[in-house]
C-alpha cells in the first residue's frame, strides 16, 4: 500500500478543501500502515520466539530438521524485509535504506569505524527508540560487538529494580547494564552472545553462544541460547536457558525462594544459579567467600566472585 500523490487542483477556491481531504486521506493511510506495522511486529515477536525454540530443538535432536530451521529463518527474514519496506513507505524516507542504517556496533564496523569505544546510535523515531550510547568492541574475535554488560570497578550496584534493568543503568565506560529493552531490540535479528571473564589471578576465559535472544517485556525478557563454545569449562548459562528475567521487585524464577533477593541482582534466575553475572562485586580478599557474587560455577565454583566480566553481542552473519 503506497501513499498516493495528488496533482495541485486547478481552481484556487478548491485548494483548501482538497488539501484538507488530502491530509485526512494521508492520515488515514498512515494510521492504517501503523496498525499493520504493529500487527506485523507482534506476529514477528511470536514467530521469532517459536523460531528460537525450533533452533534449540534442532540442535539438540537431529540434523534432518535443519531444513525447517532454514524455512523459519527465511520466513523471519522475509517479515523483516516487509517491515523495513512498510517503515520506509509510512515515513516517506527513501534517503536511507535498511542496508545503510546503523543498528548496532556491527553496522558501525561495516562503515569502517574500527576503534573500540563509545558511540551514539541514532534514534529511530518511527519505532520510538531513543538515541542510545553504546560501547563497541571493534577488536575481539573480529570486532563488531555491542557490549551489553560490564563489571570491572564495583562502583555501580546491580541490586536494582525491574524498571532500571529494563531501561539500563551505569556508566557506559565503566560498570553498566545496557537495558533489557535495548538488548531485546538488538537481538531481534539472529545474534551471537560472547561472555568474557577474568579471575583475580589474571586468567581470562570466554563463553560464546551461537544464538542469543531476549524475549520482550511481555515474555519477561526470557533468555534463549543456542550452542556453547569456549574455554571456560562447563557451560554455566545453559541452566538459565529459557528462563525469565527476575529482579528484587519481580520474582519470575523457577524457585520457591526469591532468587533475585538471595543472589542480589537482576538475572535469568532458575532455581537459582549456575552463573550470576549481575551479582555483588566483591574485591580481592572477599572474593571467594560468598554465594551472591559474580559467579560462573563451571570455572571457579559457586563462591568465587570474578574480577571482570563483559557480555557482548553481534549479528550471527557478521563478517569482519
Amino acid at each position: 500500500q503506497k501513499l498516493s500523490k495528488h496533482k495541485t487542483p486547478a481552481q484556487p477556491q478548491l485548494k483548501a478543501a482538497n488539501c484538507c481531504e488530502e491530509v485526512k486521506e494521508l492520515k488515514a493511510q498512515v494510521a492504517n500502515l501503523s496498525s499493520l506495522l504493529s500487527e506485523l511486529n507482534k506476529k514477528q515477536e511470536r514467530d521469532w520466539v517459536s523460531v528460537v525454540m525450533q533452533v534449540m530443538e534442532l540442535e539438540s535432536n537431529s540434523k534432518r530438521m535443519e531444513s525447517r530451521l532454514t524455512d523459519a529463518e527465511s520466513k523471519y527474514s522475509e517479515m523483516n524485509n516487509q517491515i523495513d519496506i512498510m517503515q520506509l513507505q509510512a515515513a516517506q524516507t527513501v534517503t536511507q535504506t535498511s542496508a545503510d542504517a546503523i543498528y548496532d556496533c556491527s553496522s558501525l564496523y561495516q562503515k569502517n569505524y574500527r576503534i573500540s569505544g563509545v558511540y551514539k546510535l541514532p534514534p529511530d523515531d518511527f519505532l520510538g527508540s531513543p538515541e542510545l550510547e553504546v560501547f563497541c568492541d571493534m577488536e575481539t574475535s573480529g570486532g563488531g560487538w555491542t557490549i551489553i554488560q560490564r563489571r570491572k570497578s564495583g562502583l555501580v550496584s546491580f541490586y536494582r529494580d525491574w524498571k532500571q534493568y529494563k531501561q539500563g543503568f551505569g556508566s557506559i565506560r565503566g560498570d553498566f547494564w545496557l537495558g533489557n529493552e535495548h538488548i531485546h531490540r538488538l537481538s531481534r535479528q539472529p545474534t551471537r552472545l560472547r561472555v568474557e571473564m577474568e579471575d583475580w589471578e589474571g586468567n581470562l576465559r570466554y563463553a560464546e553462544y551461537s544464538h542469543f535472544v531476549l524475549g520482550n517485556e511481555l515474555n519477561s525478557y526470557r533468555l534463549f541460547l543456542g550452542n556453547y563454545t569456549g574455554n571456560v569449562g562447563n557451560d554455566a548459562l545453559q541452566y538459565h536457558n529459557n528462563t525469565a528475567f527476575s529482579t528484587k521487585d519481580k520474582d519470575n524464577d523457577n524457585c520457591l525462594d526469591k532468587c533475585a533477593q538471595l543472589r542480589k541482582g537482576g538475572y535469568w534466575y532458575n532455581c537459582c544459579t549456575d552463573s550470576n553475572l549481575n551479582g555483588v562485586y566483591y574485591r580481592l580478599g572477599e572474593h571467594n567467600k560468598h554465594l551472591d557474587g559474580i559467579t560462573w560455577y563451571g570455572w571457579h565454583g559457586s563462591t568465587y566472585s570474578l574480577k571482570r566480566v563483559e557480555m557482548k553481542i553481534r549479528p550471527e552473519d557478521f563478517k569482519p
Epitope: 562502583l155 550496584s157 531501561q167 543503568f169 557506559i172
Partner: antibody, heavy 120, light 108 residues
C-alpha cells in the same frame, strides 16, 4: 565548572501541581556518565531523594512519591524538570536538583535549592 | 526500603578535636555508602563515596570506613569550617536512594 540552577514558583496551592526546572551549564545532560536527580529537604529536616532521569529519558522514582511525580529532560535546552501533583502542606520543602555520577552513585554537583511553599 | 540511622543526632566539639560519626544500614549495603556535608542555607557537598574513597578536593582530615551495615565518618582534627550537618546515603538497593537523618556538629 558544572552549575545547576533551579527555577519555578515559590508558592503553590494545595491540590495543584508543583513544577520546577533545572538548567545545567558547564556540562551536558546528554552525557552517559551521569544521571540527573531531584532531592528535597523539608524545613529543619533531612534529605529525601525524589527521582532521577537519564539522557535517554529513562526515569526512576522514589516509590513513596511514584504516583505523583514525573521527571522529564530537554536535551536541546540542557534542562530537566520536575512535576509533583496533588501537593499538600507536607510537600513544603527546599527542592534541589543535582547531578549524580554513575560510578559511585553519588551526587557530585547540586543547585543552590529553591524553597517551595504549599499554602492557600 | 533500606533505612539509614546516624548517631549521634548532634554533638559538640572544639577546634582540633577528633570527631567520629556513625551510620548504620537496616541491611547490608556492602560498600555502597556516601557521605555529605551541609552548611546552613547551602546545598550539600559530597565528601566520600564507596564508603572510604575521598572525593577530589576534599581535605584529607576527612576519612570514611566500614562495610556491610556499619560505617564511620572521621574528622581527624576539626577545623572551624567543619561545623555543619553530615549525612550518609546508601546507593546499593535502589530505588530509592536513602539518606540518614543527619548529624549536626556544633561548636562546644
Amino acid at each position: 565548572q558544572v552549575q545547576l540552577q533551579e527555577s519555578g514558583p515559590g508558592l503553590v496551592k494545595p491540590s495543584e501541581t508543583l513544577s520546577l526546572t533545572c538548567t545545567v551549564s558547564g556540562g551536558s545532560v546528554s552525557s552517559g556518565s551521569y544521571y540527573w536527580s531531584w532531592i528535597r529537604q523539608p524545613p529543619g529536616k533531612g534529605l529525601e531523594w525524589i527521582g532521577y532521569i537519564y539522557y535517554s529519558g529513562s526515569t526512576s522514582y522514589n516509590p513513596s512519591l511514584k504516583s505523583r511525580v514525573s521527571i522529564s529532560v530537554d536535551t536541546s535546552k540542557n534542562q530537566f524538570s520536575l512535576k509533583l501533583s496533588s501537593v499538600t502542606a507536607a510537600d513544603t520543602a527546599v527542592f534541589y536538583c543535582a547531578r549524580a555520577k554513575w560510578e559511585g552513585d553519588y551526587f557530585d554537583y547540586w543547585g543552590q535549592g529553591t524553597l517551595v511553599t504549599v499554602s492557600s | 526500603d533500606i533505612q539509614m540511622t546516624q548517631s549521634p543526632s548532634s554533638l559538640s566539639a572544639s577546634v582540633g578535636d577528633r570527631v567520629t560519626i556513625t551510620c548504620r544500614a537496616s541491611q547490608s549495603i556492602y560498600s555502597y555508602l556516601n557521605w555529605y556535608q551541609q552548611k546552613p542555607g547551602k546545598a550539600p557537598n559530597h565528601l566520600i563515596y564507596a564508603a572510604s574513597s575521598l572525593q577530589s578536593g576534599v581535605p584529607s582530615r576527612f576519612s570514611g570506613s566500614g562495610s556491610g551495615t556499619d560505617f564511620t565518618l572521621t574528622i581527624s582534627s576539626l577545623h572551624p569550617e567543619d561545623f555543619a550537618t553530615y549525612y550518609c546515603q546508601q546507593s546499593y538497593s535502589t530505588p530509592p536512594y536513602t539518606f540518614g537523618q543527619g548529624t549536626k556538629v556544633e561548636i562546644k
